[in-house]
């Protein structure tokens, strides 16, 4: 396993729809055809893989299981957005690469995004 | 409505290893998220772990991280927790529970979760 530099944004704001979106950058030493990246949540005491996903170079990024994030990739950037997120789940939100294939394997961790997810006011009632 | 039923706790001595069970019925298991919780004696109840409908993503707590694995058959509508280098602190009531929500979440909380199964007591000494 070989090291791998990875770049993300420390701070980003989620929206008031609850979506946040940064861009996970990484230092690819070769040409790297399948990449898999991880998002990992921390904070609350528990450790989360929000979200990941197995990609070929130049191709569309496919999230299993009901996923919270979408992301497109282009050359080492990948541009990730998480939906649905709450005010509990502020936090610090951690990009992971693993170059997969070809060898040798190349395993990056990004020094993490903090998010923060305020829950939007309710409207008052209004008399009209 | 889905049922959970849990089984696996005993008496084990600390250092030792243990695999709770979670049994669940109803049709719309594969479509949840599961979770393992513990309550100690005087103490509220904890987030433990949780994984996926499918079972490619896991939530640990801090303290059990490395040591706890989750896992699930959706074949079997079983849900498993494997408990390696159990701790005296690691004593407590283990319930399973289904996440409110179909699809994954980003965090996982106790007012996240229903359909509580009864527990199953695991003691460590020491």
């Known amino acids: 396993c070989k090291a791998m530099h990875v770049a993300q944004p420390a701070v980003v704001l989620a929206s008031s729809r609850g979506i946040a979106s940064f861009v996970c950058e990484y230092a690819s030493p070769g040409k790297a055809t399948e990449v898999r990246v991880t998002v990992l949540r921390q904070a609350d005491s528990q450790v989360t893989e929000v979200c990941a996903a197995t990609y070929m170079m130049g191709n569309e990024l496919t999230f299993l299981d009901d996923s919270i994030c979408t992301g497109t990739s282009s050359g080492n950037q990948v541009n990730l957005t998480i939906q649905g997120l709450r005010a509990m789940d502020t936090g610090l939100y951690i990009c992971k690469v693993e170059l997969m294939y070809p060898p040798p394997y190349y395993l990056g961790i990004g020094n993490g995004t903090q998010i923060y997810v305020i829950d939007p006011e309710p409207c008052p009632d209004s008399d009209f | 409505e889905v049922q959970l039923v849990e089984s696996g706790g005993q008496l084990v001595q600390a250092g030792g290893s243990l695999r709770l069970s979670c049994a669940a019925t109803?049709?719309?298991?594969?479509?949840?998220?599961l979770g393992w919780f513990r309550q100690a004696p005087g103490k509220e109840r904890e987030f433990v772990a949780a994984?996926?409908?499918?079972?490619?993503?896991?939530a640990y707590a801090d303290s059990v991280k490395g040591r706890f694995t989750i896992s699930r058959d959706n074949a079997k509508n079983t849900v498993y927790l494997q408990m390696n280098n159990l701790k005296p602190e690691d004593t407590a009531v283990y319930y399973c529970?289904?996440?409110?929500?179909?699809?994954?979440?980003?965090?996982?909380?106790?007012?996240?979760?229903?359909?509580w199964g009864q527990g199953t007591q695991v003691t460590v000494s020491s």
């Open positions: 994984i996926s409908p499918s079972g490619t993503l896991r």
């Open positions: 109803g049709h719309t298991y594969n479509t949840y998220p």
């Open positions: 529970a289904r996440h409110r929500s179909v699809g994954w979440r980003a965090s996982h909380h106790l007012s996240d979760y229903d359909n």
